[in-house]
């Protein structure tokens, strides 16, 4: 079965030191428990988080993300997942790509994280 992968359309913002959540889902929604799901960072495809065979594959992570990420899978039965990144850093700013792979079929969606300096951040409004 074919599907599309949908991520946030607008950049997600986070402060250095905070945690941030990057949502990603497939449409039409379907159970993705048996799929491979992951996030990587272009252009060098550094692995941010990888979920395969029903387990998080920590050994494949880039060192700078080890211990800082968590895949929220509460709604994976509906094809919805969220990547949580803790202790956000300036170097986390930029593009992330989320993908779902079902056997040989893979689709992905790009998203952007904007990281702001908390020492100069002014609350909107």
């Amino acid at each position: 079965g074919q599907f599309r992968v949908i991520g946030p359309r607008h950049p997600i913002r986070a402060l250095v030191g905070d945690e941030v959540e990057l949502p990603c889902r497939i449409s039409p929604g379907k159970n993705a428990t048996g799929m491979e799901v992951g996030w990587y960072r272009p252009p060098f495809s550094r692995v941010v988080h990888l979920y395969r065979n029903g387990k998080d594959q920590d050994g494949d992570q880039a060192p700078e993300y080890r211990g800082r990420t968590e895949l929220l899978k509460d709604a994976i039965g509906e094809g919805k997942v969220t990547l949580r990144i803790r202790n956000v850093r300036f170097s986390d700013e930029g593009g992330f790509t989320c993908f779902f792979r079902d056997h040989s079929y893979q689709e992905e969606a790009a998203m952007e994280l904007k990281v702001e300096d908390p020492f100069y951040w002014v609350s909107p409004g």
Partner: antibody, heavy 116, light 107 residues
Framework: EVQLLESGGGLVQPGGSLRLSCAAS????????MSWVRQAPGKGLEWVSS????????AYADSVKGRFTISRDNSKNTLYLQMNSLRAEDTAVYYC?????????WGQGTLVTVSS | DIQMTQSPSSLSASVGDRVTITCRAS??????LNWYQQKPGKAPKLLIY???TLQSGVPSRFSGSGSGTDFTLTISSLQPEDFATYYC?????????FGQGTKVEIK
């Protein structure tokens, strides 16, 4: 010319308290984050704490969290560090520095000695 | 926390020598790396920020390079006033951390 002048250091017994001050001049103090960095005798540099321009956001090293409090008074162009429950390992020269992550100007430092 | 490791911890050099100090981060920090110089009894002084940008007023014999995990501070021709201790610092996130320092001594 940017100037940062620390004061308030001295000898204190373990468990005691001290309040450090840093008087700033030569730049628009309220427009910059400020920090404290310390250096134990003969050792390297250790970041202690930083504070945002308005004072609403603060960050601390794990080694001082819950014991030290950073604050600022923009009307007086002054940065503070309230140090409570002092330990022998807090003995160091304490530097006031301009910036939150990159420190482009530093004061001359004030020595804090914690000893019985 | 991100660990910063400098090498060597000390070196002896002569005036006019080319000196290279390296700094390695325990994980990628992009280009969020600063270099400071400290002379005995004095406060540190910012030399280079963002891995390779020379701070205003710093002589051009100082240069920085690198990104990711490996960084270098180079003094192209050592001058008498350059004998000091040099520290790298990652400014990528909380907490910011420093290398242990490299002492440059007169040979």
């Amino acid at each position: 010319e940017v100037q940062l002048l620390e004061s308030g250091g001295g000898l204190v017994q373990p468990g005691g308290s001290l309040r450090l001050s840093c008087a700033a001049s030569g730049f628009t103090f309220s427009s910059y984050a400020m920090s404290w960095v310390r250096q134990a005798p003969g050792k390297g540099l250790e970041w202690v704490s930083s504070i945002s321009t308005s004072g609403s956001y603060t960050a601390y090293a794990d080694s001082v969290k819950g014991r030290f409090t950073i604050s600022r008074d923009n009307s007086k162009n002054t940065l503070y560090l309230q140090m409570n429950s002092l330990r022998a390992e807090d003995t160091a020269v304490y530097y006031c520095a301009k910036g939150g992550y990159t420190f482009d100007y530093w004061g001359q430092g004030t020595l804090v000695t914690v000893s019985s | 926390d991100i660990q910063m490791t400098q090498s060597p911890s000390s070196l002896s050099a002569s005036v006019g020598d080319r000196v290279t100090i390296t700094c390695r981060a325990s994980q990628s920090i992009s280009s969020y790396l600063n270099w400071y110089q400290q002379k005995p009894g004095k406060a540190p002084k910012l030399l280079i920020y963002s891995a390779s940008t020379l701070q205003s007023g710093v002589p051009s014999r100082f240069s920085g390079s690198g990104s990711g995990t490996d960084f270098t501070l180079t003094i192209s021709s050592l001058q008498p006033e350059d004998f000091a201790t040099y520290y790298c610092q990652q400014s990528d996130g909380n907490p910011t951390t420093f290398g242990q320092g490299t002492k440059v001594e007169i040979k």
